[in-house]
Interface confidence: low
Amino acid sequence: DPVLCFTQYEESSGKCKGLLGGGVSVKDCCLNTAYAYQERNGGLCQPCRSPRWSLWSTWAPCSVTCSEGSQLRYRRCVGWNGQCSERVALGTLEWQLQACEDKQCCPEMGGWSDWGPWEPCSVTCSKGMRTRRRACDHPAPKCGGHCPGEAQESEACDTQQVCPTHGAWAAWGPWSPCSGSCHGGPHEPKETRSRTCSAPEPSQKPPGKPCPGPAYEHRKCTGLPPCPVAGGWGPWGPVSPCPVTCGLGQTIERRTCNRPVPQHGGPSCAGDATRTHICNTAVPCPVDGEWDLWGQWSTCVRRNMKSISCEEIPGQQSRWRTCKGRKFDGHRCTGQQQDIRHCYSIQHCPLKGSWSEWSTWGLCMPPCGPNPTRARQRLCTPLLPKYPPTVSMVEGQGEKNVTFWGRPLPRCEELQGQKLVVEEKRPCLHVPACKDPEEEKL
């Protein structure tokens, strides 16, 4: 049967450690005698070494909790493929028994003394409770024992006296209306409330105590609306300086709602706290220059040579661009006005060509006319000569890339009767009408 195989056996605990895996036989697991195995159903961990006695287990708890008892411990024959000694098979337990004593003596019950006298009643009128006590000392308990039952008992008692009724205030009545209508006047508004000594009234016989404290209460009114103060504008402040150095700008004047400040819910100032004015510097703003698009590359030539077309001779060509639109001391364009590169001229060179794959379909033409069509092409593409892609410059300038320039004359085998371009056309389907989107909004 397959077992769990482990790489270690812990002698002190008898546990398997370092799981190797499951689903192997005992025989395979125990090819290494340092290993250990365990049945799948959570059985005993067995070491793969030859059988011998395990360490003794810890002593079991003492059989009694007080006075002399006894306790057991065991060890087990563990291992694989054999036995611990003659007639001692794997799994056999060996026991040891010894005397033990957790506590020298056992607890002994004590006995109660007689009940003491009843204490006075807990109240001086009507009904209450009284208590009496006894001691656990006839005899005293031994070895942590105790006496059975309670050390005190209580019973009801009646003083035969009627209790006086002391006066207590009823709830306060509602506050009277306020004596004024807003805060901050010459007389601070007040409100008043009263209460009666009737919850309950004090008894006559035996005489009860009257209610303590006043029957009336005064306080300043709260929650009254304060007398409102409307806000008023202060004067306009100075005009801010024009914030621009050229063209038109905007200056601001400000005023504050503080003469007076609105108070106690009074209305704020009506109107705007700021007003703006246009300011004119009468100075035109500078316009920075911007590079126009690069011009066409010049013909690819080499100094002192009439023509280098179709030759493996690198030449040079340049292109120019202009800085447009700079006015009123604006920034000049940054960067180079001229661009120079190295080139091979293949202008009008007969080159072997090959047909390209079909291009993607183009747009439908005409987009708004009758019967629009779309087209795709295959082109006779020239195969460029395998000239060196870079040239070495004078020392310190390193390698420079060389670009092919010019329009060659590619030669391809005829395709559908054509030598340079084969075109395929298709009508466009379900064509919508062209309408001005602004008209559609109306």
């Epitope: 769990l4 482990f6 546990k15 398997c16 450690k17 370092g18 799981l19 895996g21 499951g22 689903g23 365990q38 799948r40 959570g42």
Partner: nanobody
Framework: EVQLVESGGGLVQPGGSLRLSCAAS????????MAWVRQAPGKQRELVSE???????VYADSVKGRFTISRDNSKNTLYLQMNSLRAEDTAVYYC?????????????WGQGTLVTVSS
Amino acid sequence: EVQLVESGGGLVQPGGSLRLSCAASGRISSIIHMAWVRQAPGKQRELVSEISRVGTTVYADSVKGRFTISRDNSKNTLYLQMNSLRAEDTAVYYCNALQYEKHGGADYWGQGTLVTVSS
């Protein structure tokens, strides 16, 4: 801790099919083997099939060719497809997960699902 919950057991006629599922939750990243173990009334527990983390499978001779073990790691679920069921397949089927820890292995068990094959 790992929790295992089986489902899919029930009464089926001989020759019929059942599919058992075992949903695992908890510290499942350290599980290296999962297995189906069955216990027929009055008999010892018996390993039916097990599958390793990398998908290696083991079957008891009595179920080879009839039962298929599989696991869906995205759903943390173990399955046992049981075809051509026989009366002797009647048992409580337990899902078992074997977890690898640095200091030893731990076995986890589901509560079991009863499969009864009877006409």
